[in-house]
Structures are given as C-alpha cells and as structure tokens.
Interface confidence: low
C-alpha cells in the first residue's frame, strides 16, 4: 500500500490556445486529468488501472502551481494504491480548458483538450522527487513525481506491513526496512520476551517485565543468586536452598550454639587476649595499664593514689599531676610546711610532734588512713566479691564485676545453664552439678536435640521434569525448584508457548 504523488509545478500556454489551435475565450481556464496505469511499452487509452485524479481549475494560460501540501490541498496530487508497487508505471496527464464550472467529461466539448502527455518507465519507492518537463509545440508542463509508502508500510515495494505496538502482543517500533526494532527491555521475534534485570540468575530467577528479577522458591537476593537457608538458621549458610551449614565456631541444627564467643563477639577491649572457656564463656587477659572483666577500664596512674597529704590526683596525657592542699608541696605533696599547731590531722586523727616540733605524725581512727588521716580505708581490701568477681571502687560505693555464669551484688548467685533454653525442638532442660542435660521429644536426638530422625520428604522423588527437590525440615514437606520452562508445585506444567502473532 502506498501513494503515487504528482506535483504539478508550472504550465506554459503563452498563446492561450487549445490543442486544435483554436484560442480560448477569454483565456484557457486550465485544469488537469491524471491517469495512472500499469506499464505499457506504448501508452494507449484504456482503464486507468492504478487510479485517476482531477484537479480544479488551477490557472489561466500560463501559471505556476502552488505547493499546497501543508494546508491539506491538492498539490501534490495523491494517487493511492493498495497493492505491491510493481516498480513500473504509465502516466497520462491531460490539460483541459473549462469554459464553465462543470468539469465532468460529459459536460465539456470534445475540443476543450489543451494538451496531453504520456510517459512510462521504472520508478522505485523513495523520498526523492523525479523532476520532468514535457513540451509540445504550444505548451510546456513542468512536474515532479514519486512513490512513497502509506503509514505502516515499508520495503522497496511498500509490501511490508509493520505497525508499532507496546502491548501484550509485542513491544516494538518499525525500522526503515519494516523489520521490528524491540523497545528497550524486550527481545524475541516479536519483542514479547522481557529482558530481565542484568545478571538475574538464568535458572533461579525470571521476570514478567523488563529489568525485573523475580526469584523461584528457595532463592533470594536482587539477582536471585543467593539460596534461602533453613528457616531459623542463625549462623549458617547454604549452597542449595533450605540448607544450614554452620559457620566456623557455631553448632547445632540452626547453628545458634556459640562455640567461639571470642571470635563472634570480640568482648575483650584494649588489645586484650581472649580465651574461650566453654559455651558463651571467655576470659580476658589484659595488657598492662588496663583492668576489668573485659579489660575495658583504663588503669589510671592516679589509681595508685600517688598524691600524699590529701593532695588530689589529676590525670595527664603522659602521667599525672598532684594538686596539693595548703601547707604541702612537692611532686606528690610530700613536703609539709605545717606543725601540730596547724591541726593537720583530719577525721579525728591525733597529732604528735616530731623532731622538736619541726615535723609531726597523725594517729588515725579506725577506717581512715594516710599521713593526715585523709583517706578512707579501701572498701575492696577485704575482697568481698565471690566466685572470682572483681571488686571496683567507684565513687562512694564499691561494685562487684562478676564472671560469666554468676550474678548478684557479690557474685554469689549461680546463673542456671538452662536459662538460655539450649535444648532445640522443644527438648526439656535439666540443670546438673556440672552443666545440663536435654530430654528430647520424639523424632529428635543429640546432646541438644538438634539431630532430626524423621523421614526425608524428598525420598519419593515427587518433583517432575528434572526439578531439584528440597526438604523443609520445619514442616516435613518438600519444595520443587523448577528448571526454566516449567511451573507448578511439582514442576509438572510446561510454560505456555507465546501466542501466535495476531497479524
């Protein structure tokens, strides 16, 4: 399907005469009849097999014909055809004189013909206009013509139908040669197949629209390349779905039993060395200058109470500095300018003169110490913390820092081993003198009831079409991971072939 376009450009009839030589009165009011037909070696009268078209009166005698295409006018003249363009044609253009307004052939006198031209030849489809000029003894006609394809038709002879679409049946535009050009994100013969997100796993992922990646059962992640481990798997991984392979240092069915607290939690601070001492139990060996269960407390140089005579110690970047009370001086406030007359003994201490009054000594009441009875006796001296707890002086009180497994103000209480619910799958926990014991429900065994003894749901090979079967341990059921091209809970249904193209 296409259009033969004829653009009349200029008609010259300087003398204003008819083909018979008779002049027009008052001038030749000229219109044209065009006949387009199949190729004839000698163009002869007969049916205009490709179509006909007539113009209104375009001018008198000699005139140029205005390009009226943009305004929807009649120049170029349009001769549509609904067949494959054969590449050859015959064209007859007649110029007629219209004495009146009726331009029908039967309404015109037979000698109203001004001129007639007939051409034939080859013409390929294309945008280029072929310019031609035909001259007779009295007239000259300049015109150009071309053949172009109708909308949605393409190819060298306008025989290729292609209509862009973006729906269920295809997502494409048409190339200049009529072939399909898929819209971004689509592929396939008719551009019906979406291109999944780049990197989407071929077997484990699929998509229903471009740049999507939907995961098949048992797979996850942006590209569906990560298997989903067993439900409840804490510190384990999988290489196929529903596995739970424990990371190093973890044990149990769900890999939730910590066998390496040091590595997993790094509890020891400030460069201390950590040693595992049982499940969730550890010991920190502190570097010099640090203390505390986790070596989290920095041993200040002031902790050794270097300032004497009631001096206050202030930490510095490197070392400490003593702020001395009145009457004392020196690096540690060790030098005194006082005597008993200055009442230097605090907290009810008694002053005794020495060296003929040049010096003194304080005798302190119970719970106080120091050269001026200025210090309370260290509350940690008696080590009140039980079970290896560490005593810390903190402000006006003391505090016991307990080792793992103990609690209470003085670390006197033993934490139950069963408090952590260590028995899996509903096992019953019993505290013993040296640890614990699990009583397992039916179907489970092992020290922590972590071993499953029930049947394997995949044993009966329930999956079709070479699908992979996985057992869901928590429900005793199976899951089939279908290969590409199959769906269904057992992968029993082939994916439907794409529907035939609707043209």
């Amino acid at each position: 399907s296409g259009v033969f376009q004829l653009q009349l450009q200029e008609f010259i009839n300087e003398r204003g005469v008819l083909a018979s030589g008779r002049p027009c009165e008052p001038g030749c009011r000229t219109f044209f009849r065009v006949c387009l037909k199949h190729f004839q070696a000698v163009v002869s009268p007969g049916p205009c097999t490709f179509g006909t078209v007539s113009t209104p009166v375009l001018g008198t005698n000699s005139f140029a014909v205005r390009d009226d295409s943009s305004g929807g006018g009649r120049n170029p003249l349009q001769l549509p055809f609904n067949f494959t363009w054969p590449g050859t044609f015959s064209l007859i253009i007649e110029a007629w004189h219209a004495p009146g307004d009726d331009l029908r052939p039967e309404a015109l006198p037979p000698d109203a013909l001004i001129s007639k031209i007939a051409i034939q030849g080859s013409l390929a489809v294309g945008q280029n206009w072929l310019l031609d000029e035909q001259t007779s003894t009295l007239t000259r006609l300049r015109y150009s013509y071309r053949v172009i394809c109708s909308d949605n038709y393409y190819g060298d002879n306008c025989s290729r139908l292609c209509k862009k679409r973006n729906d269920h049946f295809g997502h494409y535009v048409c190339q200049p040669d009529g072939n399909l050009s898929c819209l971004p994100g689509w592929t396939g013969e008719y551009c019906q197949q979406p291109i999944c997100l780049s990197g989407c796993h071929e077997q484990n992922g699929y998509c229903s629209k471009p740049a999507e990646c939907l995961c098949r059962p048992g797979w996850q992640g942006r590209l569906c390349n990560e298997c989903i481990p067993h439900n409840g798997c804490r510190h384990g991984t999988c290489s196929t779905p529903w596995q739970c392979t424990c990371d190093e240092g973890w044990g149990g069915l769900f890999c939730d039993q910590d066998l390496n607290y040091c590595t997993h939690h790094s509890p020891c601070k400030n460069g201390a060395t950590c040693s595992n001492s049982g499940q969730r139990s550890y010991t920190c060996t502190c570097r010099p200058g640090y203390t505390g269960v986790d070596c989290e407390l920095e041993l200040s140089e002031c902790d050794s109470n270097p300032c004497r005579n009631g001096g206050s110690c202030k930490d510095q970047e490197d070392g400490y500095h003593c702020l001395c009370p009145p009457g004392y001086y020196g690096l540690h406030c060790e030098h005194s300018t006082l005597s008993c007359a200055d009442s230097p003994c605090f907290n009810g201490g008694s002053c005794r003169e020495r060296n003929q009054g040049a010096n003194y000594a304080c005798e302190c009441p119970p719970n106080f110490t120091g050269s001026n009875c200025e210090k309370k006796v260290d509350r940690c001296t008696s080590n009140p913390c039980a079970n290896g707890g560490q005593c810390l002086n903190r402000g006006p009180s003391r505090m016991c820092r307990c080792r793992p497994g103990f609690t209470g103000t003085y670390c006197e209480l033993h934490v139950s081993d069963c408090a952590r619910n260590p028995c899996a799958h509903g096992g019953t926990c019993h505290d013993l003198e040296n640890g614990l014991m699990c009583t397992c429900p039916a179907g489970f065994s092992g020290r922590r009831c972590e071993v499953r003894t029930s049947i394997d749901a995949c044993a009966s090979s329930p999956c079709f079409n070479r699908a992979t079967c996985y057992t869901d341990l928590s429900t005793d059921t199976f899951v089939c991971n279908c290969p590409y091209g199959f769906v269904g809970s057992r992968c029993e249904f082939p994916v439907g072939l794409p529907p035939s193209f609707p043209w």
Partner: antibody, heavy 122, light 108 residues
Framework: QVQLVQSGAEVKKPGASVKVSCKAS????????MHWVRQAPGQGLEWMGI????????SYAQKFQGRVTMTRDTSTSTVYMELSSLRSEDTAVYYC???????????????WGQGTLVTVSS | EIVLTQSPATLSLSPGERATLSCRAS??????LAWYQQKPGQAPRLLIY???NRATGIPARFSGSGSGTDFTLTISSLEPEDFAVYYC??????????FGQGTKVEIK
C-alpha cells in the same frame, strides 16, 4: 556504544570530486537512517541529504541535487558521501549524523561523526 | 522550505546569569523542534528534542518551550562550559531538515 568514525581531511582542486566515508559501530547498521550535514568555516549547519542503509535509498537537498551521491556498504557498516564538481564554496566540515528512530520517520541527530574537513583550493 | 530565524545573533552574559535564546519558524512546526550546542572544533550535541524534552545526559539547567512558530531555549544559570553556539532545527516539514543560523553565547 554508538560510534561514527569518519575518514580524514581532504584537499581538492576545483572541479574535482571528494568521497567521505562514515563507519558505524555499536548498533544495527540497517536500522537507522544516516544524514550528512556540512558546516562552512564560521557558518551554520546545512543539511545535505539522507540515506536509508537498509535499502540504500536517498534524498538530497535541492541545492545539492545532481552533485551529491550517498551510498552505503552493509558488509562494512559504512556510508559514503561523494560531492562532485567541487568549487571553493564547498570548503567545509562534513558530518555524518545518525537519525534517532521512533514511530515517526523524521527525528533528530543524537550521534554525530567527528567531522571531515574538505578544502577546495586551486 | 521552512526557514528558522534565531535571535539574538550574539548573547553576552556572565556565568551564573540566565540565558534566553529564541527561534522563530516561517510556518508552524508544531512541537517538532530541537536545540543543539556546538563548541569550536566539535560536532553539535543534541540538548532538547520535540521542543521541551531533555536528551540523555543533559543537565536540568537546560529547558525548552514553545510550539507552532515560536520557541525558546533557556539556560537557568550559565556554567563556564555553556558558552558555545546554539542551533535550532525542525523536523516538521522535510526535506530539507533545516537549522537556524545559530546564536553565540559568549562571556561578558
């Protein structure tokens, strides 16, 4: 990515012909129309013509009709523009430009060659 | 053929200022108009197509408007790299594809 690489600069005498090539890569060669646009020194852009690489059909600006010939070689994904009867006013940079295709046949030029300087001098 | 007339021929502005370039068509081109930027020694670069759509990778400071016969390219705040020659081009009525004569945006 789409690339259009043109042949090197040419110096020609008046009356001679010049043939400039434009090699396309990074896309399906036959799926996009190719245009030629020229630019005289210090002047604006002037459209010369278009070629359909699929069938080899062309359309030329009226000004160049009879002097310009655009061809293509699908085996090498190359289009050619030959301009004959050169005169001094044909001294210009000649660009090939790929037409961006959509449902309408005439679109814009997103991808251009680097340009080929043709100097016409006696 | 459709003639595109650009104004002004030269626009002298400082970085940070707003640039407004005009393109007028001799007859309606609907919204089928594009804008290109060209720097010395380089091929043109497509900025705007179909009057108001930014081409891939073009910064948001470039915007186009208009339809029919009157079109405008606006650069909201000139960057140093925006000083160049700008051409409009129509695809409404072809052949030929026609370009405007260009507007040079220079540093004041």
């Amino acid at each position: 990515q789409v690339q259009l690489v043109q042949s090197g600069a040419e110096v020609k005498k008046p009356g001679a012909s010049v043939k400039v090539s434009c090699k396309a890569s990074g896309y399906t060669f036959t799926s996009y129309y190719m245009h030629w646009v020229r630019q005289a020194p210090g002047q604006g852009l002037e459209w010369m013509g278009i070629i359909n690489p699929s069938g080899g059909s062309t359309s030329y600006a009226q000004k160049f009709q009879g002097r310009v010939t655009m061809t293509r070689d699908t085996s090498t994904s190359t289009v050619y523009m030959e301009l004959s009867s050169l005169r001094s006013e044909d001294t210009a940079v000649y660009y090939c430009a790929r037409e961006e295709y959509s449902s309408r046949s005439a679109e814009y030029f997103q991808h251009w060659g680097q340009g080929t300087l043709v100097t016409v001098s006696s | 053929e459709i003639v595109l007339t650009q104004s002004p021929a030269t626009l002298s502005l400082s970085p940070g200022e707003r640039a407004t370039l005009s393109c007028r068509a001799s007859q309606s081109v609907s919204s089928y108009l594009a804008w290109y930027q060209q720097k010395p020694g380089q091929a043109p670069r497509l900025l705007i197509y179909d009057a108001s759509n930014r081409a891939t990778g073009i910064p948001a400071r470039f915007s186009g408007s208009g339809s029919g016969t009157d079109f405008t390219l606006t650069i909201s705040s000139l960057e140093p790299e925006d000083f160049a020659v700008y051409y409009c081009q129509q695809r409404s009525n072809w052949p030929p594809w026609t370009f405007g004569q260009g507007t040079k945006v220079e540093i004041k």
